[in-house]
Amino acid sequence: LIIGFGISGRHSITVTTVASAGNIGEDGILSCTFEPDIKLSDIVIQWLKEGVIGLVHEFKEGKDELSEQDEMFRGRTAVFADQVIVGNASLRLKNVQLTDAGTYKCYIITSKGKGNANLEYKTGAFSMPEVNVDYNASSETLRCEAPRWFPQPTVVWASQVDQGANFSEVSNTSFELNSENVTMKVVSVLYNVTINNTYSCMIENDIAKATGDIKVTESEIKRRSHLQLLNSKAS
């Protein structure tokens, strides 16, 4: 995590943001904190987006002030009003869209001074993979499925026993467009698997990396999944 500070003017306050990623169709958080003030009425929060004329969100005098809000954000933004007093200016964004990606500025005014910091917000789709034994196949086969990804990810198989092995010749990956015509379902099949081994299906794009593990023994099957967002930086 890289911490940086946004400072402005002679009377300046520290504003800290964290670069993050939004999962399209879900809610997102644009993270911003600042040196708190003792009076809520003295705090002004403005969220702006590069290339957008209107405001993303404004909070001042203890309430939301959205008369200048840009049309693309109408009805989709909220601050955590009860946490503003303790220095939380983070913005909740409803139903994240691909077009929400870009550079945002969190601009703060308090009785102590002013400050701002930029935030890079990426948007895409990412989901947890699930790995199962495909009993319908003629040979021992594993099937890795993840319901929503965008942009199109890469899929790599690995195994605990055959570390460093390249499974591209014995696997097949397909991408099926979902009904909203943006995200895709990822299906990858691994053939000729051996028993008493742990296999990992790794799905990655420039936003997220997800891994689905399956351990197959004669007596049981164990599964585990993990998802990690990439490039979360503070500034």
Epitope: D27, K63, E65, S67, Q69, E71, G75
Partner: antibody
Framework: QVQLQQSGPGLVQPSQSLSITCTVS????????IHWVRQSPGKGLEWLGV???????DYNAAFISRLSISKDNSKSQVFFKMNSLQSDDTAIHYC?????????????WGQGTLVTVSA | NIVMTQSPKSMSMSVGERVTLSCKAS??????VSWYQQKPEQSPKLLIY???NRYTGVPDRFTGSGSATDFTLTISSVQAEDLADYHC?????????FGSGTKLEIK
């Protein structure tokens, strides 16, 4: 405290237009959007449209050709106008305010205006 | 349009019984579901917003749960004053839509 007060006619002739005013108090129209919802006799609720704090609007596509929502921030008033009413537009019309600036639930409702479309 | 299907259409319960009302969305609406109580000749009253958040002043016998497409309103111990119509609604995407309602009668 937050209040929404509706005023408008109870009887409308077929093919005529309906105008309802929603006057709000306890909050500013520059902070919250105002939604319009109707309820036909013995039926469920139907969302008609919203005017946001910025003045931009979103309408139910089924009514977009004959519905207009506007407001006067300084008077804390929202104006609802629907044209070309027919008998199946007979309903109680409500204005409502959301609990947050993101539409999550209508916490405050007007008292409702019963509109009967009849010759 | 997203269709919200409520079940049952009506139900008759005795005071003290547990009541479970169902609301199913035709597609994913996240947690953007709210529940309303409407008594005869009154405007609807918000009970639950964001699928599971109880609105201020609502008795804690009312609980909302669910996400994506399946939602539930539970009244842990129904009271005589709970006689009303109950509506669910989604505010995830336009047009916002409501279920057709469940009428709760008290035996």
């Amino acid at each position: 405290q937050v209040q929404l007060q509706q005023s408008g006619p109870g009887l409308v002739q077929p093919s005529q237009s309906l105008s309802i005013t929603c006057t709000v108090s306890g909050f500013s129209l520059t902070s919250y959007g105002i939604h319009w919802v109707r309820q036909s006799p013995g039926k469920g609720l139907e969302w008609l449209g919203v005017i946001w704090s910025s003045g931009s609007t979103d309408y139910n596509a089924a009514f977009i050709s004959r519905l207009s929502i506007s407001k006067d921030n300084s008077k804390s008033q929202v104006f609802f106008k629907m044209n070309s009413l027919q008998s199946d537009d007979t309903a109680i019309h409500y204005c409502a305010r959301d609990i947050t600036t993101i539409a999550e639930g209508f916490a405050y409702w007007g008292q409702g205006t019963l509109v009967t479309v009849s010759a | 349009n997203i269709v919200m299907t409520q079940s049952p259409k009506s139900m008759s319960m005795s005071v003290g019984e547990r009541v479970t009302l169902s609301c199913k969305a035709s597609e994913n609406v996240g947690t953007y579901v709210s529940w309303y109580q409407q008594k005869p000749e009154q405007s609807p009253k918000l009970l639950i917003y964001g699928a599971s958040n109880r609105y201020t002043g609502v008795p804690d016998r009312f609980t909302g749960s669910g996400s994506a497409t399946d939602f539930t309103l539970t009244i842990s111990s129904v009271q005589a004053e709970d006689l009303a119509d109950y509506h669910c609604g989604q505010s995830y995407s336009y047009p916002f839509t409501f279920g057709s309602g469940t009428k709760l009668e008290i035996k």
